[in-house]
């Protein structure tokens, strides 16, 4: 079953998504795909990335982190109730059916309504966006410099509490990295 | 128009070889998954083989895999499969189907119309 | 492999009827599934992909739904040109699987 992640309406949406390349700058292609991940590749791709680069994208689906160093995440801008369902993360490791494929379920909950006006934190001061439009070829890429890692096989209950968006959000400020792979 | 157009099916001896051509127009093809899907005289559709854009990874059917090849040429927008070692149980309809875009969809929105391969003494 | 069991195998209906036509898989498969329309003479066509999505070009009375194990493609009102056989096929796990089909017949 999907590990399942939350966000509200209006909000950035993040999901969670590492590898770690073999080498420095030794990348995997991954895509991102709206729907469970099926036998070849992702489904309705969203976002791509190949050897080198974030090769296609689409508008509201991004990536913050360091994808060179397997940071795949994917952030979803402002969104809306008919972003709920599941998420691929298919990262497509050479060779023949060896791709790792994971599949996340988005719950979008409507807004809460609140009586006093409460601080958001600006996304796109914190994190520029990277790409925003359909395209393809390089692109300039935010990086969130070097960060400390945090093993899978040290914090095993991570990835469980990482399924409230905000709670992600925070833990991709303070720099916590999953290892996969 | 998206048009696929086999070729190469006849027939053939029990252990003979034989290679399917398909010809695909209208569409970037190197955008494409391609495959082979077969169909046995009165029997159900069976999938056969996949190959990715570029032809770097090939998928077969495992009880197909050690005799039938399947290869694209990118540059002649053209997808093949070359069979080895010939049973009676391959005797077919042999469709090219168009699989997945790069950028998702459908894994078989277009076919060919298909070509008849025999295995018979 | 997954097994799809498609039903009916045939069935009998008039322009204008609503038909549906039933797949189960033989384990649950996300939503993966696409269904295909062959008439007589004629090339395979694709209708419908992940479950719900209808293919460029595929008029807004066929529909897909389901989840699970269990999906239906439905076409709302019969047109002269939608007798034909039917398949669905899932592409969830390897190798990809079609089901028998179902002929669809004037009554």
């Known amino acids: 079953s999907e590990v399942e992640y939350r966000a509200e309406v209006g909000q950035n949406a993040y999901l969670p998504c590492f590898y770690t390349p073999a080498a420095p700058g030794n990348l995997v292609p991954v895509c991102w795909g709206k729907g469970a991940c099926p036998v070849f590749e992702c489904g309705n791709v969203v976002l791509r990335t190949d050897e080198r680069d974030v090769n296609y994208w689409t508008s509201r689906y991004w990536l913050n982190g360091d994808f060179r160093k397997g940071d795949v995440s994917l952030t979803i801008e402002n969104v809306t109730l008919a972003d709920s369902g599941i998420y691929c993360c298919r990262i497509q490791i050479p060779g023949i059916m060896n791709d790792e494929k994971f599949n996340l379920k988005l719950v979008i909950k409507p807004a809460k309504v609140t009586p006093a006006p409460t601080r958001q934190r600006d996304f796109t001061a914190a994190f520029p966006r990277m790409l925003t439009t359909r395209g393809h070829g390089p692109a300039e890429t935010q990086t969130l410099g070097s960060l400390p890692d945090i093993n899978l096989t040290q914090i095993s209950t991570l990835a469980n509490e990482l399924r409230d968006s905000r709670l992600a959000n925070d833990l991709r400020d303070s720099g916590a990295t999953i290892r996969i792979g | 128009e998206v048009q696929l157009v086999e070729s190469g099916g006849g027939l053939v001896k029990p252990g003979g070889s034989l290679r399917l051509s398909c010809a695909a127009s209208?569409?970037?093809?190197?955008?494409?998954?391609m495959a082979w899907v077969r169909q046995a005289p009165g029997k159900g559709l069976e999938w056969v083989a996949n190959?990715?854009?570029?032809?770097?990874?090939?998928y077969y059917l495992d009880s197909l895999k050690s005799r039938f090849t399947i290869s694209r040429d990118n540059a002649k927008n053209s997808l093949y499969l070359q069979m080895n070692s010939l049973r009676a149980e391959d005797t077919a309809v042999y469709y090219c189907a168009r699989g997945l875009y790069y950028y998702g969809g459908n894994y078989f929105a277009y076919w060919g119309q298909g070509t008849l391969v025999t295995v018979s003494s | 492999d997954i097994q799809m069991t498609q039903s009916p195998s045939s069935l009998s209906a008039s322009v204008g009827d609503r038909v549906t036509i039933t797949c189960h898989a033989s384990q649950g498969i996300s939503s993966n599934i696409g269904w295909l329309q062959q008439k007589p003479g004629k090339a395979f066509k694709g209708l419908i992909y992940?479950?719900?999505n209808l293919e460029d070009g595929v008029p807004s009375r066929f529909s897909g739904s389901g989840s699970g194990a269990d999906y239906t493609l439905t076409i709302s009102s019969l047109q002269p040109e939608d007798f034909a056989t039917y398949y669905c096929v899932q592409f969830a796990q390897f190798p990809p699987t079609f089901g028998q089909g179902t002929k669809l017949e004037i009554k």
């Open positions: 209208g569409f970037t093809f190197s955008d494409y998954y």
């Open positions: 190959i990715n854009y570029d032809g770097s990874n090939t």
């Open positions: 992940q479950g719900s």
